[in-house]
Each structure stands twice: as C-alpha cells, then as structure tokens.
C-alpha cells in the first residue's frame, strides 16, 4: 500500500516593488503554483486557522505600513516611520479573510514608493482544519 | 477514494490579562476546539518535535518575564524590565514538558500585572512525531 | 480502518560551538533521528518549498555572519559586527540548496571565534511538495 | 522636495587630497544609506562608495580601496568622500546619491546629486 | 566580476520604438535597472526590477528581461528622449554594476 501524501499546504509568496500613498502595496504572485490566490491586491484567506507570516522589504521613502485581515479589526502588523521592514508573525485567520497593505507616506512631495525586496509570505499551520473555496 | 486528510495539528493560544509578581501569567484558551490543553496554569506538551512559539502582550508596569518548558533548563524565552512582548521563537520540546511564566516586578508596589493583547501561541512542527496522551 | 499518519517533516537542528574567520560555522548535528543531513559542513536541501529558519548564539568576539543556500544569491540572514544572534526566518529553498556559513572577524589577533549556543534550526513548511533524495 | 547637494570638487596635482561634501535635504538623512557615483569625461558611470545609515559600515569599488574613505554627519546631514593619492584617472564628476542598504538583496540608486568636478592634473 | 555590454550608440526616428539592450552573463536570472541621463545632468531613474516605472517616468518607457539581455524599450521616442542609458545591476562581490551606455539619438 502506498503510505498517505500531504495533500498540499496552503502558503504563497507574495512580491511588491511598488506602494501608494493612502493606498497599499501592489502585489503580484510570481509562481503559477501556489494553493493561494489574489484577487483585488489582496491574498483571499480559504482555511481556517493559524498563518506564519513573514513581510521583508527596503523603502524608498519613509513611511508607515500596516498589515490587515479583516474590516474593524486590528493590524497584524503596524509599523510607524520606517524604511524597512523584516518581520514574522503568527495569527489566526479564517475563511472570508482577506490581507492587504495599507501606507501612508509623511511627504506630499511624491505619491509612489519603490520597494527593493519586498516579499510577503502567509503559510497556513492548521492543515486539516475547515477550508472553504 | 478519499484522498488522506491531516489529523489535526496539535496547537493552541492560550491569553493572559494578568500576572503575579514571583508567580506567572494567568493563561485561559478562549476555544475548546484546542488540541493542546491547559492544566495547572501550563500548556501541557504531549507530542515530541519543535513547536512555533509567538508570545505578545503590553504590561501595565514594568517586569521581568521568562517562559520555562523544564525544570532546570533554561527559558525559552527571557525579557528583562520590559513593558511589553513581540517575541517568536521556535524550540524542541518532548512529552511531559510543560510551558508556563515567571514573572518578577521591581517595585514593591503591587502584586498584580495587567496584560493588554496577552497571548501565546504553541504550534507543533513535526506532525508524524511521537506522541503520549 | 487506522487513520493515516504524518509521514515525517524534514526538519534538522545542527549546533556549532565554534566558528572560522574567512571561512564558516563548524556544524554538528546532535541526534541521529534528524531527517535532513550535513555534508562538508553545509545542511542539504531536498525538499522544495519554504522554511522556518531560527538562528541563535553568543560569539566570542565580534564578528560579521551571512547565511547563504546557494552561490550568486543573496543571504538568507545578513549581520553586521555582531557579538549574538537570535533570529527567525521563512524562506523558500530547493532541491539542491546548500545552507552554509560566512564569517568575517573584524580583527587580525585571532582565527578561531568561540559560540555558545549555537543553534541553526530548518523546518520545512511545504510538505507533500517535490522532494528528491 | 529631496536635494542633494555636492561640493567641494577642485583641481589638484597628483598625489594630492580633497574631500567632497553632499549636503542632503527633504527627507531624514540619518535613515538612508548613500553613495558616491563617478563618471570620467566622455564615459560611463561608476560605483565607488557606500555608508549605511547609520555609519557603521562601509564599502568601496576595488579602484578606490585604500585611497578614498566615505562617511557621514547625521547631525549635520552631510555625505563626505574624503581622497587621498589622487590619480589622473580619478578625474571625474562625482555624484551623491541615494541607495538601499547592501544587505538588501538586490539595489539601485533613486535619488542623485547634480555632481561636483574633481580634476586631477600636474 | 560582472559584465554588461551596451551598444555605444543608437539611433531611432521620431516616434518609432528605439529598442535598447543590456546583455549580460544569465542576466534573466538578475534585476535590471535602467538610468537616463541627458547632457549635462544628473542621472535619472526610469526603470527598476526590470519592468517597473518610478513615479514621473511616462508610460513610453518599458523594460524587459530574459535570458542573456534586457531590453528597454520607449515606445514612441521624442526628441526629449535623446540621452544616454544606462542599465546597472546589483553584484554581491562587485556591488554596483552600470552599462558602458547607449546613445539615442533621435533623428
């Protein structure tokens, strides 16, 4: 008998090299392959349960960034004034979540911020869990 | 056929709005669909491997906090005089391990700590592993 | 009918106590049961798909570190004249990946940099993706 | 609006010394890294310099190493390049301009200075 | 170290595409970004990661890459096009790496 495979995890790798002010980051899936889709800049959220989540990224301009899941609810990241970012995170998200960037800039003299290295990476921990597509 | 489904990821988060100065954090799991559980103010560690580990919280005074799994083995986590935690980590823990705080104050003033956003986060790593319940 | 099981994670924890300028970190891996391997002191990549990547110790002096998984692209972690680390990564390896170190010494008096707890942990994400072996 | 402004470029004999000043202003200078970019009389541009931004690491283009030495006024919001044993072949405009840091894994220069000429000459 | 070859010069009428190439060693597998710089001035930015475009730069100016060479193209060049270009890669021996540099002319 041929011993059980893992059906596949959901995880994807997200990347951006652009974000607008009072916007987001406009993000694109570089592989074809990935168990997780964007749709309207942001990464649709299908399984229940907890994400590892790591966000890396160099800015061209200062600026303040948050990570969101869910309309009313807090960041899963906020940082204020940065220029870079490099952090992981962990956190439970549910079907119907979606996560998406929200910027401001602290200078009225561009609108655009070029992003050397910017990647988002959500990988779902709870494989087995509810998941709705 | 049914492809093979994934048993369930042993995991939990477990919150905590209060510490005891010399004593821990009061931890309660808000879901009784956990797969780890909570006894004595611990998370009891019934499955071999390394587990995720993501501790968060902003304290109402200033403290000492370490998060232990064995006696006699050093912490997994240790901050000292902070206000407040982000911390993750990742750590091999077996069967019969136990993960709970200790929490020291440097002020005379008060016994009680309180814990704004306190949560912590366990997620098992090697599924397949040994397991004991 | 018995529920399937996990088949197991590839995962290792290497440990080095001591490290060469010029050169890298002498890795060792403490148990036998690990399901990935060291070869001429780097840690083999046969599975693709993300890692948990955790990276921790205290160094005798100070010292530049950069973990690499493959010539010609950049570090998985990058630090500058440092005298610890405690870090945690996700990053996306392959087949054929490598992960090895590069250590700079900032001084002409010595060669050898003693670590104490030394620890670099791989834990693979993606199981049920391509592995070769 | 971001400036960056060079000075400081001369005429010197071979052998000689000068330093460069980039005086930087728009944005918060002390959270940017920053380099120097030459270009010889009729040729292409060349990398020779980068400071992190706090001015705790350094880098240098092989042709300069030894010779030339970058750094940085936080409080002062000023690039210096500071050369010594200059050489006829040193003989450029040298630009500021700023980066992302080099542990990035990737990197480009999106802010540039309007130059400042050094000549080196007997 | 790294090398990337540039033609010296290029000419192109009046708004008709000017192609210009940047080849290099497997350089698909790299980023590359592309500077303009007119006589007399400082460089500008146009392109970074091979194909995105700064805020400012018309939407003219596109670039591509894939295996050996990275192109960029302006799709209609103007007469304020006529400049040198530059393209540049990131080496993690060699750090900045430019281009020779092309000349448009625009005729």
């Known amino acids: 008998q041929v011993p059980p495979q893992y059906p596949p995890i959901q995880s994807i790798r997200v990347q951006f090299t652009r974000c607008e002010n009072e916007k987001g980051c406009i993000i694109t899936s570089p592989s074809k392959d990935e168990t997780m889709k964007v749709q309207d800049n942001s990464i649709i959220i299908n399984c229940d349960g907890f994400y590892l989540i790591s966000l890396k990224g160099y800015f061209s301009e200062e600026l303040s960034l948050s990570l969101y899941y869910r309309k009313g609810r807090g960041p899963l990241f906020s940082l204020s004034k940065v220029t870079s970012v490099d952090s992981i995170g962990v956190a439970y998200l549910a079907f119907k979540d979606k996560v998406y960037f929200n910027v401001t800039t602290h200078s009225t003299s561009y609108k655009d911020i070029q992003v050397n290295g910017g990647e988002l990476i959500l990988i779902h921990q709870n494989p087995g869990g509810f998941c709705a597509y | 056929q049914v492809p093979p489904q994934y048993p369930p990821i042993q995991s939990i988060r477990v919150q905590f709005t209060r510490c005891e100065n010399e004593k821990g954090c009061i931890i309660t799991s808000p879901s009784k669909d956990e797969t780890m559980k909570v006894q004595d103010n611990s998370i009891i560690i019934n499955c071999d491997g390394f587990y995720l580990i993501s501790l968060k919280g902003y304290f109402s005074e200033e403290l000492s906090l370490s998060l232990y799994y064995r006696k006699g083995r050093g912490p997994l986590f240790s901050l000292s005089k902070v206000t407040s935690v982000d911390s993750i980590g990742v750590a091999y823990l077996a069967f019969k391990d136990k993960v709970y705080f200790n929490v020291t104050t440097h002020s005379t003033s008060y016994k009680d700590i309180q814990v704004n956003g306190g949560e912590l986060i366990l997620i098992h790593q090697n599924p397949g592993g040994f397991c004991a319940y | 009918q018995v529920p399937p099981q996990y088949p197991p994670i590839q995962s290792i924890r290497v440990q080095f106590t001591r490290c060469e300028n010029e050169k890298g970190c002498i890795i060792t891996s403490p148990s036998k049961d690990e399901t990935m391997k060291v070869q001429d002191n780097s840690i083999i990549i046969n599975c693709d798909g993300f890692y948990l990547i955790s990276l921790k110790g205290y160094f005798s002096e100070e010292l530049s570190l950069s973990l690499y998984y493959r010539k010609g692209r950049g570090p998985l972690f990058s630090l500058s004249k440092v005298t610890s680390v405690d870090s945690i990564g996700v990053a996306y390896l392959a087949f054929k990946d490598k992960v090895y170190f590069n250590v700079t010494t900032h001084s002409t008096s010595y060669k050898d940099i003693q670590v104490n707890g030394g620890e670099l942990i791989l834990i693979h994400q993606n199981p049920g993706g391509f592995c070769a072996y | 609006e971001v400036q960056l402004v060079e000075s400081g470029g001369d005429l010197v004999k071979p052998g000689g010394s000068l330093r460069l000043s980039c005086v930087a202003s728009g944005f918060t200078f002390s959270s940017f890294p920053m380099s120097w970019v030459r270009q010889a009389p009729g040729k292409g541009l060349q990398w020779v310099a980068y400071?992190?931004?706090?001015?705790?690491?350094?880098s240098y283009a092989d042709v300069v190493k030894g010779r030339f030495t970058i750094s940085r006024d936080n409080a002062k919001n000023t690039l210096y390049l500071q050369m010594n044993s200059l050489r006829a072949d040193d003989t450029a405009v040298y630009y500021c301009a700023r980066t992302f840091p080099t542990v990035a894994t990737d990197n480009w220069f999106y802010y540039w200075g309007q130059g400042t000429l050094v000549t080196v000459s007997s | 170290s790294y090398v990337l070859t540039q033609l010296p010069s290029k000419n192109v009428t009046l708004k008709q595409a000017a192609h210009i190439t940047c080849g290099g060693d497997n350089i698909g597998s790299k980023s590359v970004h592309w500077y303009q710089q007119k006589l007399g001035q400082a460089p500008v930015l146009i392109i970074y990661y091979d194909s995105s475009r700064p805020t400012g730069i018309p939407e003219r100016f596109s670039g591509a890459n894939s295996g050996n060479t990275a192109t960029l193209t302006i799709s209609g060049a103007l007469a304020e096009d006529e400049a040198d270009y530059y393209c540049q890669v990131w080496d993690s021996s060699a750090k900045w790496v430019f281009g020779e540099g092309t000349q448009l002319t625009v005729l």
């Open positions: 400071i992190n931004s706090g001015g705790s690491s350094t």
